[in-house]
Interface confidence: medium
């Protein structure tokens, strides 16, 4: 199939980084500055994405690949290919229409993005609460009394009231 296609369509010989220029008898011409073609056989090159404003350049555009953006400090990416930047909040907060708000009691957020999530209900899993939750951290579930076989460690290290950093999901 590929061989047949190349006999019928000379453009299929044009590699990535070029385009098939109809104005020049279908000669493969390099993509102009600030444009790219990531696949062969293209009849046009695509304009490079420009990372402006709250976006910053993570990867420069080349003749064969588009630029990639991320967000300036204080913001994080949302959407495929970082199509949007959303404001960071502090751990223990979530972003609402009115800005960053503290997590309600019984919920936590251990990241600078996303929503406050309910503390885990340890009892649903037959466990007990080993360490209480905070706005920034989920509870830590411990074994149920039945799980503590003789000789098993039941020493609980002290948990700081407010711990630095964040715990991941």
């Amino acid at each position: 199939f590929e061989r047949t296609r190349s006999l019928q369509d000379p453009c299929s010989n044009c590699p990535a980084g070029t385009f098939c220029d109809n104005n020049r008898n279908q000669i493969c011409s390099p993509c102009p500055p600030n444009s790219f073609s990531s696949a062969g056989g293209q009849r046009t090159c695509d304009i490079c994405r420009q990372c402006k404003g709250v976006f910053r350049t993570r990867k420069e555009c080349s003749s064969t690949s588009n630029a990639e953006c991320d967000c300036t400090p204080g913001f994080h990416c949302l959407g495929a290919g970082c199509s949007m930047c959303e404001q960071d909040c502090k751990q223990g907060q979530e972003l609402t229409k009115k800005g960053c708000k503290d997590c309600c009691f019984g919920t936590f957020n251990d990241q600078k993005r996303g929503i406050c999530r309910p503390w885990t209900n340890c009892s649903l899993d037959g466990k007990s609460v080993l360490v209480n939750g905070t706005k920034e951290r989920d509870v830590v579930c411990g074994p149920s009394p039945a799980d503590l076989s003789p000789g098993a460690s039941s020493v609980t290290p002290p948990a700081p009231a407010r711990e630095p950093g964040h715990s991941p999901q």
Partner: antibody, heavy 119, light 107 residues
Framework: QVQLQQPGAELVRPGASVKLSCKAS????????INWVKQRPGQGLEWIGN????????NYNQKFKDKATLTVDKSSSTAYMQLSSPTSEDSAVYYC????????????WGQGTTLTVSS | DIQMTQSTSSLSASLGDRVTISCRAS??????LNWYQQKPDGTVKLLIY???RLHSGVPSRFSGSGSGTDYSLTISNLEQEDFATYFC?????????FGGGTKLEIK
């Protein structure tokens, strides 16, 4: 009992994307995070990212952000990890593992899928 | 990222011995430290979580201790099935990170 079932092996050509699966059983799928961990031959373990099946909320290790895409199918209690443009560097054992709550440990692991990237 | 260092990559011991495997974090991880065992066939199991809590079904010859940045796993009275590779992992900060592993071999 809790089980995370993974295919034993997958073979993929360089550049062709691959989707690894992890079928969960024996617990409420939507209540536990599914994580993916990479282990190269003779090497340590690397956390790739995780997904909360209830709402498909994901976290990624920055190192794998452009390589891995995590999804779930709640109807079949299966988690997936798609690897884009695989190279020989992606040849490894990939484990799925679960945990319940923030900071909790990985309490159950799949057997791992050995991915071979070769032409 | 928090770096987890297991300074001993392999360790030889005999049946009945008591061994201690250490793990150091590049910053305080407030006891959010877990230990796993990996058998030669690749099977991975949780042993200890939150520094010293024994996971259900794990024999009491396994114990964990530590605080701040320094943690350890102790296996007393080694049995044949304990010869495996042991990994520490921090659950404090994204991304979750593991130590490089300590392979426990029979002397």
């Amino acid at each position: 009992q809790v089980q995370l079932q993974q295919p034993g092996a997958e073979l993929v050509r360089p550049g062709a994307s691959v989707k690894l699966s992890c079928k969960a059983s024996g617990y409420i799928f939507t209540s536990y995070w599914i994580n993916w961990v990479k282990q190269r031959p003779g090497q340590g373990l690397e956390w790739i990212g995780n997904i909360y099946p209830s709402d498909s909320y994901t976290n990624y290790n920055q190192k794998f952000k452009d390589k891995a895409t995590l999804t779930v199918d709640k109807s079949s209690s299966t988690a997936y990890m798609q690897l884009s443009s695989p190279t020989s560097e992606d040849s490894a054992v990939y484990y799925c593992t679960r945990f319940h709550y923030g900071s909790s440990p990985f309490d159950n692991w799949g057997q791992g899928t050995t991915l071979t990237v070769s032409s | 990222d928090i770096q987890m260092t297991q300074s001993t990559s392999s360790l030889s011991a005999s049946l009945g011995d008591r061994v201690t495997i250490s793990c150091r974090a590049s910053q305080d991880i407030s006891h959010y430290l877990n230990w796993y065992q990996q058998k030669p066939d690749g099977t991975v199991k949780l042993l200890i979580y939150y520094t010293s809590r024994l996971h259900s079904g794990v024999p009491s010859r396994f114990s964990g201790s530590g605080s701040g940045t320094d943690y350890s796993l102790t296996i007393s009275n080694l049995e044949q099935e304990d010869f495996a590779t042991y990994f520490c992992q921090q659950g404090h900060t994204l991304p979750r990170t593991f130590g490089g592993g300590t392979k426990l071999e029979i002397k």
